[in-house]
Amino acid sequence: QPPPPPPDATCHQVRSFFQRLQPGLKWVPETPVPGSDLQVCLPKGPTCCSRKMEEKYQLTARLNMEQLLQSASMELKFLIIQNAAVFQEAFEIVVRHAKNYTNAMFKNNYPSLTPQAFEFVGEFFTDVSLYILGSDINVDDMVNELFDSLFPVIYTQLMNPGLPDSALDINECLRGARRDLKVFGNFPKLIMTQVSKSLQVTRIFLQALNLGIEVINTTDHLKFSKDCGRMLTRMWYCSYCQGLMMVKPCGGYCNVVMQGCMAGVVEIDKYWREYILSLEELVNGMYRIYDMENVLLGLFSTIHDSIQYVQKNAGKLTTTIGKLCAHSQQRQYRSAYYPEDLFIDKKVLKVAHVEHEETLSSRRRELIQKLKSFISFYSALPGYICSHSPVAENDTLCWNGQELVERYSQKAARNGMKNQFNLHELKMKGPEPVVSQIIDKLKHINQLLRTMSMPKGRVLDKNLDEEGFESGDCGDDEDECIGGSGDGMIKVKNQLRFLAELAYDLDVDDAPGNSQQATPKDNEISTFHNLGNVHSPLK
């Protein structure tokens, strides 16, 4: 006995629906047909679908799936993209402020050094920016270059102000002597340690965020397999062939199909979880010498200390270096000890410490909290997509891929699918090459995040002190502890506040011959939704 004809004996409803997908009706039968050429929507009787319609449904199903996936990841994608941009800009602003603090220190304390010092400071902070963005620069080389460049100017302008300009031909010799004699004490090493640790962490933080974007972009633009396309077509469109336009797929059936389609994507889950937890660990450790904001904004103070160290030993140094690195016309070696007054602007430089409402560190923690709400993103994707596409509630009166059923049974559905394609096989195929690649990248960044030499919790504060940061003793040589916290000493108390009122914000471009003081650009402020205020150390 033949099966009953479809409810719409004329395929009228099917035609009008299909026309929305594909203008023109040439592929839609006017009345039900046997459909022996169909490969996906295998008919139990006459059908309102043709092979061409089936192909169109498959294409549409895969496009729908891509759109659903993109809308599923939209919030997460926006979160990471926005934060990556905000942090990148924030770090650039920190670098710019750090450069300005340092220039202001030279301008206020060592005006005779300013034209050259501004240039060297500018080059140093340019390298800092490039390093953060991933450039292959060695941090120790950057710091050495800064001090190598500064010392000849300090020597010729401050320690030997009578030397002719041509004395700069002894730069090579002076650079050798400055390091052989450790003329800046351990300050260059201290700066190397602080800057390399904080920049390394900053750089990997940005790298990790950018990889997060890449992961989402990769899974966002996955092209689903033909097998998946067939499964989706059966779930979403095969019911139409029978004229069942209003029937929704069973929820359980949708989950089975989605798990099959997304088996490869779900493999990212383990590494994605690890990525978020490793990133959290990194962020928790980003304080003191691992916090670039803290380190860079205090650099001017350490550089100031290092020049004071040279000044303290100026008498002995001038004699020793004067003999080795004299200008070729200058035969006598003056041993002039220049008093402090020559070196130090006697203005007392104080900084008001204002508690800030929001800093980069709180912003980082906030990001981690939001990211943690997406920790199960990949494992939850199949369920998410089913809940955001039309499915029948309670699995009653729903489409199971073959027919309308009162109650969905997974076993029956699986049995019904066996002849057409094997769901298990689909799962066993393994992830797409692009997914494998992104998994490899996640493994790599997770390894990097884990192996970062970061303090594990606040217990290590003592050890950080021993490294010389903000500590009472400045290494083996007590003599290096000049002006540690006395009058005239500049200390930036902790983080930058982003409502900038930098009175002295002089950019290197304006600085050399220009006492005008530029103010930070307005867009710098708006970017941060008012993350507090910047307080200049130099008023």
């Epitope: 090579e172 020793t320 003999k323 004299a326």
Partner: antibody
């Protein structure tokens, strides 16, 4: 590239004199301090003398008063005048330049033999 | 005057790590340079200012300096590393440049 070419070594009797020369090329000679370092047969390196960019001189205690270091920036040349030579001065003598990487370039060495 | 003390010899198997020490009173306050010398050749700078490496010197060579000891470390030692190694400092108080006695590195 940086080159230091030495000449002037040879055999000399105890109490005799010898003048070593070292010609620099491939760098701004006047910007670097220069050194003489020697190595007795089968022994280690021993610093002998140095001269600063402006002509300031330095000597090891073992050669002070007998050896004189000098330079001629116009000729890109370094010299070591060795007087009152002794058997223990027998060695390969190297000239070397001193700059931002300390003593970073060496001559090929020249053998001085003091023997009767 | 200032004295630098090195062990006369160090032996190491290929692929292992060799450590050559250089002792001196408060040497950590000075900058230490290391030279490699192969038979019949002029010395070559391998580490300068405690830990910097000139271009062309493999990353396997590294240096450290603190307290009374400076150390040259050669990781993953190769047969071609067999040579004499000298440490050197400038003792500015006596205006002398000082070399250590040298260490012969033998690769087993």
């Amino acid at each position: 590239q940086v080159q230091l070419v030495q000449s002037g070594g040879g055999l000399v009797h105890p109490g005799g004199s010898l003048r070593l020369s070292c010609a620099g090329s491939g760098f701004t000679f006047s910007s670097y301090a220069m050194h003489w370092v020697r190595q007795a047969p089968g022994k280690g390196l021993e610093w002998v003398s140095a001269i600063g960019t402006g002509g300031g001189t330095y000597y090891a205690d073992s050669v002070k008063g007998r050896f004189t270091i000098s330079r001629d920036n116009a000729k890109n040349s370094l010299y070591l005048q060795m007087n009152s030579l002794r058997a223990e001065d027998t060695a390969v003598y190297y000239c070397a330049r001193y700059g931002r990487k300390s003593i970073d370039a060496w001559g090929q060495g020249t053998l001085v033999t003091v023997s009767s | 005057s200032y004295v630098l003390t090195q062990p006369p010899s160090v032996s190491v198997a290929p692929g292992k790590t060799a450590r050559i020490t250089c002792g001196g009173n408060n040497i950590g306050s000075k900058s230490v340079h290391w030279y490699q010398q192969k038979p019949g050749q002029a010395p070559v700078l391998v580490i300068y200012y405690d830990s910097d490496r000139p271009s062309g010197i493999p990353e396997r060579f590294s240096g450290s300096n603190s307290g009374n000891t400076a150390t040259l470390t050669i990781s993953r030692v190769e047969a071609g590393d067999e040579a004499d190694y000298y440490c050197q400092v400038w003792d500015s108080s006596s205006d002398h440049w000082v070399f250590g006695g040298g260490t012969k590195l033998t690769v087993l």
